[in-house]
């Protein structure tokens, strides 16, 4: 590359025959040598030319030569078939020198005035070559004043000869299991003065196979083996080649995972080169035989190193390795020709023995103990005392290995206790407290814990009671001794239950009236439902139609009797509901503060007195019969009343349960 222009001294001038513009003399010989700077040539043209014409300009002539080459021999005035006169032609030196020779012979038949010529040095455009001549540069030629330089396309580098472009074709590494490689520019002629190295490097265990494809044309020699251009193939085992000529070499099975291909070219020749398609092989793994009820994917004729297959089981079958389940299975062929994992089994899905249903049973429908795919089981609840909650109880063993209901549920059905069952089918007449018989009040709960109180069983693990009855134990739930399934207060034969937690209505304020006098006790275990232990129902929305004024409810408990002692046997009384305004008015005179009776309360009893609940009955249920469902429900909770139970003109006051259904449902669902 030039280091910046160095302008040469200008070269130009005039030449003329001796005596010009007069006639030239005989026997004259004159020689001019013109020299231009390197990279420049000389341009010459004639402004006047008048020499004796002779055959082939033998007599008088002007001869132009550049180096050893004669550019022109000129004579006459006009050109003929055999002689040339310059006319308007311009003459150029071949290099930077031009020799001009003028000669006249011994005689002229008439006078001739000779010649006048002008010359000047001009830049040679080395990049322009005559047709058929080799180009100055392999790729790009750049002319400049006094010289030129060559450059190469991307991927080539200029050889030290400053003209040839050698290919940058070393260091290519092929790692795919198959591919193609070729001489640079294939199928166009490959570059000169190049040394190319290609590497195929596959994982250990693969063997490279080389196939020469399409055409092969590498400069050769008739006697010597590939002296000019050649292709060599080297593996860790042996060398193949050199290859040249026009014949496609045979397939080469290298038995190696690494191959080096070397291609060397010299400065001459015009050949199209070569193309190789390579593939690879490896020791095949045993053909995978799908397990029963499974299939292999993908299916191939053979499986070699790095090839893999997966096993897919039919619906209702699962992948197992022994007892251990697999979500998917893929094995890969290793270099030693073995699979990296053993074949799993496709075993029929087994949902296993179904879970026991609390308060229910399960029946095998498909067959005794059959728990495999598509097997059917039927859950049912213990009749009379339990009913299945929104579920038909039919479960199928599905492909995911879970027992699944017709609604797609995987959880067990729920056996809910039947509520409101009683040996009493109707309310009795209004008369004094009666002894309860077995099964009359199976929801009745006896609460001992400092004082005697009562409650009513809800579902199979909750007790509904009055807030004031359990207020002292709200932070020590385990102190509550809860008994059920007995009529006799002091009997040793009862079902024991213990409290897990006590929930007192947030609106209840102890020692400040009895508004919101309601509480729930969560039992730490479910109780077994039977004819003597059955929950009470919560009121339906329509329940108020069975709780109008004068409708009869039943209160039960072991509270104080008319004799002033706690009852030994469970007692009950049938009492009518009292008009709310009447009840409110009854408790507005001293000693009761105004507003004692709220909208969250209902009153029951006789105006004449004598029939009432009393201390010790607190928290017990005031129940009513829903004549539509024929089930008993809790309408009230024994809360408070006159200082003297059963006093005339006073009434028992009960927490109105229907007002608390959302509160009850929220607590039960949350806990």
């Amino acid at each position: 590359t030039p280091l910046g222009p160095k302008w040469p001294e200008p070269v130009f001038g005039r030449l003329a025959s001796p005596g010009f513009p007069g006639e030239y003399a005989n026997d004259q010989e004159r020689r001019w040598t013109l020299t231009a700077p390197p990279g420049y040539r000389l341009r010459l043209y004639f402004t006047h030319f008048d020499l004796e014409l002779s055959h082939l300009c033998e007599y008088d002539f002007v001869k132009l030569s550049s180096g050893a080459k004669v550019l022109a021999t000129l004579c006459g005035q006009e050109s003929t078939d055999t002689e040339r006169a310059p006319g308007k032609d311009t003459f150029y030196s071949l290099g930077s020198s031009l020799d001009i020779t003028f000669r006249s012979d011994y005689s002229n038949e008439k006078p001739f005035t000779g010649f006048e010529a002008f010359y000047a040095a001009e830049d040679i455009d080395e990049c322009q070559v005559a047709p058929g001549e080799a180009p100055t540069c392999d790729h790009h030629c750049h002319n400049h004043l006094g010289g030129f330089y060559c450059s190469c396309r991307a991927g080539y580098v200029l050889h030290r000869n400053k003209r040839t472009c050698s290919a940058l074709c070393s260091g290519q590494v092929f790692t795919q299991r198959s591919g193609e490689l070729s001489s640079p520019e294939y199928p166009r002629p490959y570059p000169k003065l190049s040394s190319c190295t290609y590497s195929i490097s596959l994982e250990e265990g693969f063997s490279v196979i080389l196939d020469f494809v399409e055409s092969f044309d590498v400069e050769t020699h008739p006697e010597t083996l590939c002296p000019y251009d050649f292709l060599k193939i080297q593996t860790d085992r042996e060398e193949h080649g050199p290859f040249c000529g026009k014949t496609l070499p045979h397939r080469i099975e290298t038995k190696s995972n690494t191959v080096t291909i070397t291609f060397v070219t010299d400065e001459s020749g015009d050949h199209t080169g070569w193309k190789i398609h390579y593939t690879s092989t490896a020791q095949p793994c045993p053909y995978p035989m799908a397990p029963p009820n499974g299939h292999v994917s993908p299916v191939q004729a053979k499986y070699i190193l790095k090839d893999s297959f997966s096993i897919f089981c039919e619906t209702g079958y699962e992948l197992l390795q022994g007892h251990l389940p697999l979500k998917s299975f893929t094995a890969v062929c290793q270099k030693d020709g073995s699979w990296d994992r053993p074949m799993p089994a496709c075993s029929i899905v087994d949902c296993g023995p179904p879970d026991d249903l609390p308060s229910g049973r399960v029946e095998y429908i498909t067959g005794p103990g059959v728990t495999t795919y598509k097997a059917v089981i039927q859950y049912s609840c213990e009749e009379t005392f339990y009913t299945m909650k929104v579920n038909d109880g039919k479960y199928v063993c599905e492909a995911d290995g879970f027992w699944t209901s017709s609604k797609g549920e995987k959880s067990l059905p729920v056996c809910e206790p039947v509520c409101g069952l009683s040996a009493r089918t109707t309310g009795g007449q209004i008369y004094g407290g009666q002894k309860a018989k077995p099964g009359d009040f199976p929801w009745q709960v006896l609460i001992l814990g400092g004082t005697t109180a009562a409650g009513a069983l809800l579902y199979d693990n909750w007790v509904l009671t009055a807030a004031h009855a359990v207020y002292e134990q709200k932070h020590d739930a385990s102190a509550l001794d809860i008994r059920m399934g007995t009529l006799k207060r002091l009997s040793p034969h009862y079902t024991q239950a213990w409290s897990e937690a006590v929930f007192i209505h947030e609106g209840y304020t102890h020692d400040a009236g009895f508004d919101n006098d309601i509480a729930l006790i969560k039992l730490n275990n479910k109780v077994v439902i039977n004819s003597n232990i059955t929950p009470i129902c919560l009121p339906r929305k329509e329940a108020e139609s069975f709780m109008r004024t004068d409708d009869i409810g039943t209160a039960s408990g072991w509270g104080l009797t008319q004799r002033g002692f706690l009852a030994r046997n469970l007692m009950y009384v049938d009492i009518p509901i009292v008009d709310h305004q009447k009840c409110t008015a009854a408790y507005e005179k001293p000693p009761y503060p105004r507003g004692s009776v709220t909208a969250n309360m209902l009153c029951a009893g006789l105006e004449s007195g004598g029939k009432d609940s009393c201390r010790g009955d607190s928290g017990g249920a005031l129940v009513f019969l829903d004549s539509e469902t024929e089930r008993w429900f809790v309408g009230g909770i024994v809360s408070w009343g006159s200082m003297n139970c059963g006093e005339a003109g006073q009434y028992g006051v009960y927490t109105k349960v229907i007002n608390y259904i959302p509160w009850i449902e929220n607590i039960i669902s949350d806990f």
């Epitope: 390795q321 022994g322 007892h323 251990l324 389940p325 697999l326 979500k327 998917s328 994992r341 053993p342 995911d400 290995g401 879970f402």
Partner: antibody, heavy 114, light 107 residues
Framework: QVQLQESGPGLVKPSETLSLTCTVS?????????WNWIRQPPGKKLEWMGY???????SYNPSLKSRITISRDTSKNQFSLKLSSVTAADTAVYYC???????WGQGTLVTVSS | EIVMTQSPATLSVSPGERATLSCKAS??????VAWYQQKPGQSPRALIY???YRYSGIPARFSGSGSGTEFTLTISSLQSEDFAVYFC?????????FGGGTKVEIK
Amino acid sequence: QVQLQESGPGLVKPSETLSLTCTVSGYSITSDYAWNWIRQPPGKKLEWMGYISYSGRTSYNPSLKSRITISRDTSKNQFSLKLSSVTAADTAVYYCSRHYGDYWGQGTLVTVSS
Amino acid sequence: EIVMTQSPATLSVSPGERATLSCKASQNVGTNVAWYQQKPGQSPRALIYSASYRYSGIPARFSGSGSGTEFTLTISSLQSEDFAVYFCHQYNENPLTFGGGTKVEIK
């Protein structure tokens, strides 16, 4: 890198419930495999307790079936062991592991004592 | 349940020597057997699964063989770090069971 880590109380009273959690990192417990609980009483051999599979199905050692529950929390990539009504015989190093034991937790010693 | 019986209970071997550990199943378990190495105070380390498949990262000196009821773990040339207790484990059926272990100690 798949890692399993057991956590839970090192001391449990007799008749109470032993609760342990295995936290898995580097692999989702729903992606594949069975996820086991295995224990090793002092100086004794390993005992497989049960597994929960990628799909949430469980399999228990029949000798423990009435007392054992294995569950999982996929949002936390954890699976848990509950063993009820424990006695001194349940004192052991408890391990969680994947499938046929390619990865194990470091183990946690649980002592049953009043 | 399937009982896995390992023998010998203790094996005394010099470094560089070959160790052969045996495990017998009380009934056919196919090839559903794994081998573990356990060092004091550490959790077991998996060596072999499916009777003969070596886990990646496990040195080639460890190899497993057998099927049905008889299984072998071979350590071709014992290194100092190989002295430990080795357990076999069947996962063919519920309950999965383990052998009592073979202690490989320095002779």
